[in-house]
Each structure stands twice: as C-alpha cells, then as structure tokens.
C-alpha cells in the first residue's frame, strides 16, 4: 500500500541524518572538576594539558604538560595527595563494564622526570594513591601490592590471587556488574594507615565459556566464572591490612555478622568512617535483609571488632532491600551517627538519620517522591538529590538541608537556576563542600557551573556547549514531551518525541523504546541526540518511552509490583500505554513497533509475543530470554531462587521461548553480540532455536566478537543501519 511518509516542508533547517548520529556529531560535553582540596581542582584541557585551578586566588597553571602525557601515550592521570607525584595511565585495555587493565608510569613533579627503579609491573588491574602522602596500592595478577613511596620496592600484601579463581582487591565478574559497580574492591582508611580489601573466591563457580573468533585459525575460548540464578556464588571475605607492617603481619579478617553468616550472603559495600572505624554492609542471598556493621580497631588485640550493638538491619517486607543497590551511609562528623536513604512507612525512599538504632531513626525527608542520593554531609549541611520538584519523577534537583538548624531547613539549590534548560542535575563537591560544581544534563543543552558552597552563588560557567548550540541551529530537532497517563489506579510517565512540525491531525508511525528493568528509569528530563532523535527528525516517526511498574523513584508499591514475577507487568504496562497513545488520535495503528536492548530486549520480545496484535514489528538487541540464564545476584534479587520450593514455576513461565508460537504474526529482528559476557549469546540462541522449532519466520543478526554494548565503531554503524532498514521496511517508509 502507499507509504505515508511525513516530509517536513518550507524550512531552511535540515533534518538529522543517521550519519550525524553514528559520527557523534551532536555529542555534548560535561565538566567535572577533579578536586584536590577545598578550593583547588585539576582538569584535563582539550589539548590534554593537566591544569591546576585555585578558585579563590583565580590562579591556573599547567601542572603536567601534554608533551609529558604524550611521551607515554597517557589517557588518564592521578595526582598524589602530597602533590609530589602523578601516575599516568596508558595502554587502556577494557575487560568488563568497569574493569580494565593499563600500564602506569609515575612522574615526579619535583624533579620533572619519571620515577626510575622498581617500575610498576604491567598490566595493572587497579592502582590508587593513599588519601594522604604518596603510598600506592595496586592489583597485579589478582594480588595486592603496596609501595610506601613510588620509588620504593613493592610489598606483596596478598598471595592467594589466581586467575579466574581468587580475586584480591578487585571484584569478580558478578560483583563488578551486579553489586559494586566498580573495578576495585579495596579502600584506604582516611589517614592511609589501613587498607581494606575483599577477597572473592570463585573456585566453585560454574564457568561460562564462549568463542572469541579473532583472526586466528582457531577461535580462543573465553572462560568466566559466572554464577547464573541458583548456582554456587563467590565466597567473600573482607580483610584489613595495617600498612605500617605490611611485611610482618598478615591482613586481619573482618568478622561477618552472625545473622548474615548463617546462610549464603553477599558483601555489598565498605565505608571508612574514621581512621580506626569502618562500616561494612552485608546482604543475605535472598536480598530482602541487609546488615550494616560498624567495626572498630582494637589496638590491644590488633584486630577489628564488630559489636552486635553496632549492627543495623534493613529489611523489606514487600520486595528487595534498597533500590537497585542498597544505599550507603553518609556519616556525620561524630563518626557514630549517619544519614541513609531507605523506604519509609509509606514505601517512599527517604533520608533517615540513625544515631543508635534503625528503629529510632529520625526521618529527614518525606513525601510522595524519593530522595535519590546523598552527595555530602558537612558540619552544618547535607546535600542530596531528589525528584520532588513539581512532582516529576524524571527530574533531579539538588537540595541542601541545614542540619545545624533546629528544625532542619531545606533549600532547593537548583530548582530555579535555569528552569527551562535544566531539570536534571548531578553535583561534584570539594572536600567539605566549600565549593561545588553542578552538571545539568537537560532537557536543554547540558551546562556545567561552579558554585560557592555557602551562598550557592554561581561563580563561573565551566562548560556550556556553545559549539553544540551553534551546530544545532540549522537542525530540525523533534519536540520532546514528558507527560503522564492514567489507567485504573495507575499513573505512567512517558516521554514522547514528536517529529518537527508535528500535526495532531495526521497519522504517524509509532516506535516504543523500552528498557523497563527493575529500578530503572527511562523517562528522564535529559538532553539527547541519538538514533531515536534521528528517527523522529528525519523519518517522521513518533517515539515513546514509558516507565511502567517496576521502574524507580515512584515508591515501593510501583517498584515492587514486579517482585518475583518479572516479565508480566512491565509488558502489560507498555501495552496499556500503546492503547492510550492510539486513543490520542495521531498514531497509525497499523504501524507500531517496539524495540529494546538487554532487559528492554526481553520486554520487547514478550510484548511482540503478547498476542495482542498491537505491534507490526519489533527488535530485540541482546535480550535476556530466561532469568535462569542471567546472573544470580540480579535474577535472584527480583525473582528469588529457581527451585521448586521457591519460584521455579515463574522462572519457567517468564521465558521468551515459552511464547515462540506467538511470534508468528509479527516481524521480529533478533540481534546479539557473540562475545557478550553479560547477557550471554545463549539467550538469543535459545530464542532462535525455539522459533525454528515452532517453524516461525524471523530475522536475526549476530555481531562477531562484540560484547553487550556492540560498541565497536564498525559494528555500531552496521547495527543502527540494519535496524533503520528493518524499521523503514516495517513502516513502509521509502529510502
């Protein structure tokens, strides 16, 4: 039938092209100061000089020239706290999401030369300075080493490290991805006397093995200890080393709380409170009970003691503990009391002040919105972000609570700064919040500014993306709306990206972009020029993103609705939204598609297989197809265990494969990278097998040697070009 293409007319501005997106033509910049004191910071300039800035004296100078950086091909740096040395990082080699190895060189700023003798081994898995002076801790071949000074020989702290078996000071795969969200698992005490670290023992974990084809005659096999749902998990132990005697005395193990140690458990985070006080957080394998344990160094025993009366239990009765992760405490100056975000009695995540017991916690914020992150606690102020302002869950503003006052007074620092341009902020504070940088991500062009921590006065614009603003002047950008729709007693926020010169009386094809994972959020007031922006701008497609049940920052009732039944409400709510969009009158109901990546690939697959007839076609990139195939920490957090006496039935019912027959009446494009360490290719292989067995036609594309991000330049270009062709064909749009 004739194509109904929307063509913008009578405008000198041009539409976005796919090439614009693939070339990153319209990418924005942010500016995060690398704070080195209350009023000083470093920043890497456009031409790769490392520049020192003093806010108060207004002085700035190059502390490390780009020629020194180039001499070792450095791409990153780190200044020692005594300002005598800089480490230069080069030969960056990515491993998993956060982890990478690199070569490190130490540059002596006093002498203006590289430190020779006892050079660091290569490649190093992690390296960091002590918080005071210039001690170095690093991880090499899964063991931790310590240098008292950069030119000194190293002391080996751990000896148990073994590839794919025992990891010291760095997480294994599952902890990196699903628990810590870091490449490191070691933490210096504030005075640099102690070094805490985690040992992960993966000896009993099953291995995921996949082929990496490379260029050789034979592919090589990648082996990763990867616990899938219900499998054996890593065994974790936390140790603390006294760096005064790293050679003489072995690391001291920190005891695990009894109520945690009685069954399978996780370590979730470590926070130094003071030079001889540390706070550890633990989580039961069934992730609805978290224990925060405060431990003290006992000089007389030379050991760490964690008294029972310093254990604080956080429990969820409606779902899992915490949001995506259990929140971490922000300790006050007294090193005893702390502020922490957890659910209040109404199920909204808010800041609480804990002095002795969780039962006696004082609620600091309240309302039908959520506190999201505590940035800094000082003597008289607490800075945090929330989505309170004007009731939009997808906004982020920064607030200050004056805790010196009684009762504490609250001020929104960002709400009225650049109200139209900026509704989604993060912040970066100097040590005691004397100054801070605000980074606004949208909805307008991102802008980074510097502020006085006492008056909140703007001191300077650090980055305002002027070049981007100029280059967008002649581009027809789509219009972005963030609104809510109601269905029964539920409210769903959505973002709609409308083609330029959108006309409500016309009919447009609709593409739903979905993620939908527990505690995620897609409807955010942020700036973006990406593939879907192009689809709206050039191809006249309406794009919608909907935050259904299970998504974050709207209370536990909404969040925990999906607990133990993934794949039900997330899909249902996308379908509900599509029906509501059709009712709006400008959607061509014959041309509706859905696409998603990762969890979004799972939801889009289930939506296509819902049997509703709403979708003509859809794309799943790197989808999960069964929660039994995914990582234990993630799957079990939301689904429990895949055992008969727990939740095996829903594990089986919620697979994509179980719906194979229902793909018969949709056009399905299935895409996966063969070297996906996260959502294994196995997931798509099983979908494909089920579709073949059901004799259902579908399209597929694999990306050889690509991981979960399919991010290599060539692959990404191919991927988006391929998906564009598929969509245009589905929507009968001419090339």
């Amino acid at each position: 039938r004739p194509s109904r293409v929307y063509k913008p007319e009578g405008n000198t501005k041009r539409a976005l092209t796919l090439k614009d997106i693939l070339n990153g033509t319209f990418s924005y910049k942010t500016y995060f100061p690398n704070w080195i004191s209350e009023q000083e910071y470093l920043h890497q300039s456009e031409d790769d000089n490392i520049v020192f800035y003093n806010i108060e004296t207004r002085e700035s100078y190059i502390i490390l020239s780009n020629s020194t950086m180039k001499s070792v091909n450095a791409t990153d740096y780190g200044l020692s706290p005594d300002r005598q040395f800089v480490y230069l990082e080069s030969d960056y080699s990515k491993l998993w999401r956060y982890s990478y190895t690199a070569t490190y060189y130490i540059y002596d700023l006093q002498n203006g030369e590289f430190v020779r003798g006892y050079e660091l081994p290569r490649p190093i898995q992690y390296l960091c300075w002590s918080p005071v002076g210039s001690k170095l801790a690093y991880v090499y071949q899964n063991n931790i080493y310590l240098k008292q000074r950069p030119g000194d020989p190293p002391f080996q702290i751990t000896y148990t490290g073994r590839e794919n078996r025992i990891f010291n000071g760095i997480p294994d795969w599952v902890y990196e991805e699903e628990m810590l969200a870091t490449k490191y698992a070691l933490w210096w005490s504030p005075d640099g006397k102690f070094l805490a670290y985690v040992e992960f023992n993966d000896s009993d974990i099953p291995i995921i093995a996949y082929s990496y084809y490379g260029d050789g005659q034979y592919p090589r096999t990648i082996n990763i200890p990867y616990p899938k749902a219900g499998a054996k998990n890593p065994v974790v132990r936390v140790f603390i080393v006294d760096t005064t005697y790293p050679h003489h005395v072995g690391p001291m193990e920190v005891p695990v709380p009894e109520m945690i140690a009685s069954s399978d458990y996780y370590f979730s985070w470590l926070t130094w409170v003071s030079s001889e006080r540390v706070c550890l957080q633990w989580l039961k394998r069934v992730q609805n009970v978290s224990v925060l344990s405060i431990c003290d160094f006992r000089e007389d025993w030379h050991a760490w003691e964690c008294p029972k009366n310093q254990e604080h239990v956080e429990e969820s009765r409606t779902g899992w503990a915490g949001g995506f992760f259990v929140s971490t405490p922000a300790f006050s100056q007294d090193a005893t009391s702390y502020y922490k975000i957890f659910s209040d009695k109404d199920g909204y995540k808010h800041i609480h002040y804990i002095k002795d017991t969780v039962e006696n916690a004082i609620q600091i914020t309240s309302g039908k919105w959520e506190a999201i992150y505590i940035f800094r606690v000082t003597q008289d102020s607490l800075f945090y972000s929330s989505n309170e302002f004007e009731g939009y869950p997808g906004r982020r503003n920064i607030y200050r609570i004056s805790i010196g006052n009684s009762p504490p007074s609250k001020k929104c620092v960002t709400c009225h700064l650049r109200k139209e341009r900026c509704q989604y902020y993060t912040a970066s504070f100097s040590y005691k919040a004397k100054y801070y940088a605000l980074v606004c991500y949208g909805p307008g062009l991102p802008i980074s500014t510097l502020h006085d921590g006492r008056t909140d006065q703007e001191i300077q614009v650090l980055e305002e993306n002027k070049e981007l603003e100029n280059s967008l002047r002649n581009i027809q950008l789509p219009k972005v709306e963030i609104k809510k729709l109601k269905d029964g007693g539920l409210t769903f926020w959505y973002k709609m990206i409308l083609p330029p010169q959108f006309d409500r009386s016309k009919k447009y094809p609709l593409l739903i972009q979905v993620y939908g994972g527990p505690c995620s959020q897609s409807v955010k007031s942020v700036f973006a020029v990406n593939w879907i922006t192009y689809l709206a701008s050039k191809e006249g497609i309406v794009i919608a993103l909907v935050d259904g049940r299970g998504t974050a920052f709207q209370g536990d009732k909404f969040l925990h609705a999906v607990y133990r039944k993934l794949g039900v409400y997330e899909v249902e709510d996308q379908l509900t939204a599509v029906r509501k969009f059709i009712e709006m009158g400008f959607i061509d109901e014959e041309r509706i598609a859905i696409w998603g990546w990762s969890y979004g690939g799972y939801v889009s697959s289930l939506a296509l297989a819902s049997g509703t007839g709403l979708f003509k076609c859809g794309i799943a990139v790197a989808p999960v197809s069964s929660w039994e195939y995914y990582a234990s920490i993630y799957s079990e957090r939301f689904m429990g265990l895949p055992t008969k006496d727990d939740n095996l039935e829903h594990y089986k019912n919620s697979t994509v494969m179980a719906r194979a027959e229902y793909f018969r009446n949709v056009d399905y494009l299935l895409i996966h990278g063969t070297a996906d360490d996260n959502v294994h290719f196995q997931n798509s292989a099983q979908i494909a097998k089920a579709l073949v067995n059901a004799q259902v036609d579908f399209q597929a594309m694999w990306y050889s040697d690509q991981n979960h991000g399919i991010s290599s330049g060539r692959s990404q270009n191919h991927l988006y070009t391929h998906m564009t062709h598929f969509l245009k064909q589905c929507f009968s749009l001419s090339d």
């Epitope: 080996q156 050679h247 003489h248 005395v249 072995g250």
Partner: antibody, heavy 120, light 107 residues
Amino acid sequence: QLQLQESGPGLVKPSETLSLTCTVSGGSISSSSSYWGWIRQPPGKGLEWIGSIYYSGSTNYNPSLKSRVTISVDTSKNQFSLKLRSVTAADTAVYYCVRDKGYYYGMDVWGQGTTVTVSS
Amino acid sequence: EIVLTQSPATLSLSPGERATLSCRASQSVSSYLAWYQQKPGQAPRLLIYDASNRATGIPARFSGSGSGTDFTLTISSLEPEDFAVYYCQQRSNWPPTFGQGTKVEIK
C-alpha cells in the same frame, strides 16, 4: 646459597650496650622482598622476636624492647646490626639473625646464633 | 599480643610413629602461622608457612593444617632426625610471637 653469620662480643656488662653484626653472604641485603631481623632465645626458653630492618633503613621493633633497641643496615658491607642498650641479666640469650620473607613465607634463613652473656 | 599455647609440652614417641602437635592462639590468626624445628645447639629451621605450605626442602612427612585459632603440625612417620623442639609462630598480629615449644623425644 644465602648464609647469615652473627658476630660480636659474647660478654657484656649490665647497663652497657650489646652490639651484634650480621653479615649476609651468597645474596644481596638489598633484596626487595626481604626484611632482616633479630630473634633471641634465653637459655632453656622459647624464641622472642626483637625487630627487623629493610635495606632502605625502615625498622620495626617489638614494643616490649622498643625503647632500648636500634637496628641499622650497611648495604655497602651487606651487613645489618643490633644495638640493645641498658642490658640486664634477663638479656642473656642466644641471638639469631634471620632473613624474614614476610608474614606469608616466614623466616626462611637463620644464622647459627651467637651466645651473649650479661654479667659483671 | 597474641599468646600461642602449644600442647603437649613433651611428646614421647618411637620412630615410625605419627606425631600430632597442637598450637592454639588466644585469638584468630587466620592462616598466618608458621612452624619451626630446632635441634639442640642449632638454629631453628622453617618447616611450614601459611599454616599448611611446606618450605623448600622439607620432606612430605611434615604437614600443617588449621586456621583461625587451632593449628596442627603432623609428622606422619617419625624419622630419627625428627626428634627436636617444634615452635609455632603467628604473623597475624603485632608483634609476631612464638609458642613456648613442644619437645618431641624418643620414647
């Protein structure tokens, strides 16, 4: 093969300073993975760790002896030394010098020991 | 400081017999425990490091086990040259300390 040899006077008067030297042969005292230490054993008794030194000169002492002990190193001579001030009869012991490979590998090379008697 | 208590003080056995020596710590020392052998008029010799690893050149009849507070040195079949005093040493706590020793004598 690494060897250690203690030397010094076998008799020291009370309140004086005991001085011993350990000579390292068959290897360098500047090895980055070793500390060099002193252990003593009073007659018919157990072993007591006195202290140790790194080739760079950094030292660690047993708190019970810290106020009286000094350990020093001379890398050019491949030697390290022990000084114990204000000795009493309770300091009479066999003194051993050792190579200390650290908390994990232990004290793997010992000198044969030298007897020091504190008596007037 | 950590106190290491060795038992028994004396063990009287015949060649070929199995010797089991115990070392108990006043608090956990993890696995940071070494065993030394000392013969009359000689310096001690390192036998076992990190609770269970044999030092270079030590015969397989010597084995170490345990972690936390309870450790054992086992000599599976006593040879004549094994009759000596055995010391355990902890490296978990500052300062490193030794046990008082167990004497293994010929019965």
